[in-house]
C-alpha cells in the first residue's frame, strides 16, 4: 500500500504565439481545481476507462478575476498535494490523466458551472520511494508544470511497496530470509503477500502466497507447535501424543480482515488494522469519501466529507456501476425507432434513420399532416410535404401516444421535480437546493455546498437519458 502524490506547480499559457484567453473575467470570476486519474501499465487507454489505480480531486483554488488588458498570467492554484492512495503493489509503470477544471462563480441560478479547461495524459515509469519527478505537459495553448512521486505507507517498503516492515520477533536478529528494514533497523522486512492467515509471529514468506514456518512451528499457517518444548501459546485441549497443549483455531486464523487488513489477536478476540480507505470491525466498510474522487468518467459524487458518511456516484450518460466505472452499451437499449441504426459515438448517441423517418430517435414519420392527429396535446408540423408530431412534455413516439418517462427513475434529489423531453430531462429544484440533480443545498448566505467531484455537465443543462 502507498500513496501517489502530485504537486501542481503552475498552470498558465504556454510559450509561443496564440496565448489562450483567460478562463475568468470580471463578469465571470472563476477558480481552478484539478483531477488526477491513474491507471496501471503503459497501455494507451481511452480517457473513459476506469482509473484502476485511483483518482483524486484537489481543493478549489483562490478566486481569480481577469484584469482587463493584462496578459493571462499563471493562474492561482489550490493549496496542497493531490494524493491517490493505492492499496496493492505499486506497478512501476503507470498512465496518468490530469484534468484542469474551471468553476465559474457567476450569478447563475443553478449554482456554479464546471467546465474542463485542459486535459493532459502521459505514461511513465516510476519506482516507489524515489525522489520527486518533474514534468511539463502542454494541452493546446495551456502549459501544466507538476511533480509527482510514489511513496509506500508504513509498514510497506520497497520499490513496489510489496514488503512489510514488522517489529523483530527476536531482539538480536530477523527471521530466516528476512533483512533489517532500513531505515528502521529495529524492524525487519517481510514480503507483504504471504498466504492469508499466515501467522505474523511464527511464519514468513519469500514468495507470494506461501507461508514458511520459523523453527518450532508447523502447519499450513505456522500456528501448530512442533513439540512439547514449543508449547508457547497454549489455548486448546491437551494432546495425548505430544503431552502439550495444541492450539485450537486462533481468532486470526484464516485472516478475518477483508480488503488487505492485517489481523492481530487481542485477549478476547482479534483486531483488524485497516488499510487507508477502509474501516469497520473487519475492514469491510469502504471509508472512501467524495474528497477521494471515487467517481470515474465525469461521475458526480454526492455524500459526506467524513469517512463515516457514504458516497454515491451519479453517473453521466453511458456509464454505470457504483463508481461509474462501467461503460453502458447504450445501443442495446434500442433507442432508435422505426428501424433506425444506432451509433454510439461515446459522447452521444446518434440514430441513422431509414428513409421516411427523422428526429433524434427516428421517431418522426415524414408523411403529410393531412388527416393526421397527434395525441396528448401534440401538434403536427408540416414542412415541404413532410410532417412530424411535436409532442407535449411527457409524451413521445410518432403520434405522441407513448409515455416517455425517464423521470420514473427519480433522478432529482431533495424533492426536485423531474421534467422529461426527447432531448433529455431536467430537474426543477425545490426551494433551498440547486445543481443539475438538485444535489447541493443552498446555504442561507447564498453559498452552496459544492460537490467533491466535477460533474460532466453544467447545472441546468439537459441531461440525456439514453
Amino acid at each position: 500500500a502507498g500513496v501517489f502524490e502530485l504537486q501542481i506547480h503552475s498552470f498558465g499559457p504556454g510559450p509561443g504565439p496564440g496565448a489562450p484567453r483567460s478562463p475568468c473575467s470580471a463578469r465571470l470570476p472563476c477558480r481552478l481545481f484539478f483531477r488526477v486519474c491513474l491507471k496501471p501499465g503503459l497501455s494507451e487507454e481511452a480517457a473513459e476507462s476506469p482509473c484502476a489505480l485511483g483518482a483524486a480531486l484537489s481543493a478549489r483554488g483562490p478566486v481569480y478575476t481577469e484584469q482587463p488588458g493584462a496578459p493571462a498570467p499563471d493562474l492561482p492554484l489550490p493549496d496542497g498535494l493531490l494524493q491517490v492512495p493505492f492499496r496493492d503493489a505499486w506497478p512501476g509503470t503507470f498512465s496518468f490523466i490530469i484534468e484542469t477544471w474551471r468553476e465559474e462563480l457567476g450569478d447563475q441560478i443553478g449554482g456554479p458551472a464546471w467546465s474542463l479547461l485542459a486535459r493532459v495524459a502521459g505514461r511513465r515509469r516510476l519506482a516507489a520511494g524515489g525522489p520527486w519527478a518533474r514534468d511539463i505537459q502542454r494541452a493546446g495553448a495551456w502549459e501544466l508544470r507538476f511533480s509527482y512521486r510514489a511513496r509506500c505507507e508504513p509498514p510497506a517498503v520497497g520499490t513496489a511497496c510489496t514488503r512489510l516492515c514488522r517489529p523483530r520477533s527476536a531482539p538480536s536478529r530477523c527471521g530466516p530470509g528476512l533483512r533489517p528494514c532500513a531505515p528502521l533497523e529495529d524492524e525487519c522486512e517481510a514480503p507483504l503477500v504471504c498466504r492469508a492467515g499466515c501467522s505474523p509471529e511464527h511464519g514468513f514468506c519469500e514468495q507470494p502466497g506461501e507461508c514458511r514456518c520459523l523453527e518450532g512451528w508447523t502447519g499450513p499457517l505456522c500456528t501448530v507447535p512442533v513439540s512439547t518444548s514449543s508449547c508457547l501459546s497454549p489455548r486448546g485441549p491437551s494432546s495425548a501424543t505430544t503431552g502439550c497443549l495444541v492450539p485450537g483455531p486462533g481468532p486470526c486464523d484464516g485472516n478475518p480482515c477483508a480488503n488487505g487488513g492485517s489481523c492481530s489477536e487481542t485477549p478476547r478476540s482479534f483486531e483488524c488494522t485497516c488499510p487507508r480507505g477502509f474501516y469497520g470491525l473487519r475492514c469491510e466498510v469502504s471509508g472512501v469519501t467524495c474528497a477521494d474522487g471515487p467517481c470515474f468518467n465525469g461521475g458526480l459524487c454526492v455524500g459526506g466529507a467524513d469517512p463515516d458518511s457514504a458516497y454515491i456516484c451519479h453517473c453521466p450518460p453511458g456509464f454505470q456501476g457504483s463508481n461509474c466505472e462501467k461503460r453502458v452499451d447504450r445501443c442495446s437499449l434500442q433507442p432508435c425507432r422505426n428501424g433506425g441504426l444506432c451509433l454510439d459515438l461515446g459522447h452521444a448517441l446518434r440514430c441513422r434513420c431509414r428513409a421516411g423517418f427523422a428526429g433524434p430517435r427516428c421517431e418522426h414519420d415524414l408523411d403529410d399532416c393531412a388527416g393526421r392527429a397527434c395525441a396528448n396535446g401534440g401538434t403536427c408540423v408540416e414542412g415541404g410535404g413532410a410532417h412530424r408530431c411535436s409532442c407535449a412534455l411527457g409524451f413521445g413516439g410518432r403520434d405522441c401516444r407513448e409515455r416517455a418517462d425517464p423521470c420514473a427513475a427519480r433522478p432529482c434529489a431533495h424533492g426536485g421535480r423531474c421534467y422529461a423531453h426527447f432531448s433529455g430531462l431536467v430537474c426543477a429544484c425545490a426551494p433551498g437546493y440547486m445543481g443539475a440533480r438538485c444535489e447541493f443545498p443552498v446555504h442561507p448566505d447564498g453559498a452552496s455546498a459544492l460537490p467533491a467531484a466535477p460533474p460532466g455537465l453544467r447545472p441546468g443543462d439537459p441531461q440525456r437519458y439514453l
Partner: antibody, heavy 115, light 112 residues
C-alpha cells in the same frame, strides 16, 4: 436573489393581441416551468400555460389552447405570453410564476380590453 | 385535467383561533418521481400570490410556523394554528404534478 419582472400595464381593443414579458433578473429561467396565470377582477387564479425554457416546449390549458402562445428567450432570460382575439372577458391581471413550486411570482401585468 | 376542490370557500375565524382548509384532487397527485406537487398559496388583497407550503407539507422560507400542511394522494389540508390579522386573504391549493397545472377555487379567510 432571483426576481420575475413583468412588463407594464396594457389597454387593448377587442379582437387585438397582447404580448406580456417576464424577465428573470439575478438568475436564469433554466429548468423550471415558467407558468402564466391570470386573475380576472374578483375571481380566482387560472393557469393558462407554461414553458420550460431549456426545452422550448410549451403546454397550454385546453381553454386557451387556440389563442395563447408562450415562448422563451434563453439568451435574455425572458418568457413571453401572447394572447390573441382579445375580448372584454380577457381583462385581468396576468402573472408569471416559477413552477412547479410556485416559489417566485411576478408583480402582475394588468391587461384591460375595452372598446 | 385534474380538478381541484376546496372547502370551505369562506372561513370567518376569530383572532388567535385555529383555521383549517381542505383541498381534494380528482386523481392522485403522486408523480412518477415519487413526489407530490401540491402547493398552498396565500393571496392578500391587492398583492400577487405567495407560496406558503410546497409538496404537501414543506414550509417555504420565511413562512411563519403557524402554517402547516398535511395529506397524501388526493386529500390535503392547510392548518393555521392561531390566526393573526395579517393572515386575512384567499388561500389556494394548486397541483403541479400534471399538465395543465390547476388551482382550487380558493378559500377566503376573514376575521369575525
Amino acid at each position: 436573489q432571483v426576481q420575475l419582472v413583468q412588463s407594464g400595464a396594457e389597454v387593448k381593443k377587442p379582437g387585438s393581441s397582447v404580448k406580456v414579458s417576464c424577465k428573470a433578473s439575478g438568475g436564469t429561467l433554466s429548468s423550471y416551468v415558467i407558468s402564466w396565470v391570470r386573475q380576472a377582477p374578483g375571481q380566482g387564479l387560472e393557469w393558462m400555460g407554461g414553458i420550460i425554457p431549456i426545452f422550448g416546449t410549451a403546454n397550454y390549458a385546453q381553454k386557451f389552447q387556440d389563442r395563447v402562445t408562450i415562448t422563451a428567450d434563453k439568451s435574455t432570460n425572458t418568457a413571453y405570453m401572447e394572447l390573441t382575439s382579445l375580448t372584454s372577458e380577457d381583462t385581468a391581471v396576468y402573472y408569471c410564476a416559477r413552477d412547479p413550486f410556485s416559489d417566485l411570482w411576478g408583480r402582475g401585468t394588468m391587461v384591460t380590453v375595452s372598446s | 385535467d385534474i380538478v381541484m376542490t376546496q372547502s370551505p370557500l369562506s372561513s370567518p375565524v376569530t383572532l388567535g383561533q385555529p383555521a383549517s382548509i381542505s383541498c381534494r384532487s380528482s386523481q392522485s397527485l403522486v408523480h412518477s418521481d415519487g413526489n407530490t406537487y401540491l402547493n398552498w398559496l396565500q393571496q392578500r388583497p391587492g398583492q400577487p400570490p405567495r407560496l406558503l407550503i410546497y409538496q404537501i407539507s414543506n414550509p417555504f422560507s420565511g413562512v411563519p410556523d403557524r402554517f402547516s400542511g398535511s395529506g397524501a394522494g388526493t386529500d390535503f389540508t392547510l392548518k393555521i394554528s392561531r390566526v393573526e390579522a395579517e393572515d386575512v386573504g384567499v388561500y389556494y391549493c394548486m397541483q403541479a404534478t400534471q399538465f395543465p397545472h390547476t388551482f382550487g377555487p380558493g378559500t377566503k379567510v376573514e376575521i369575525k
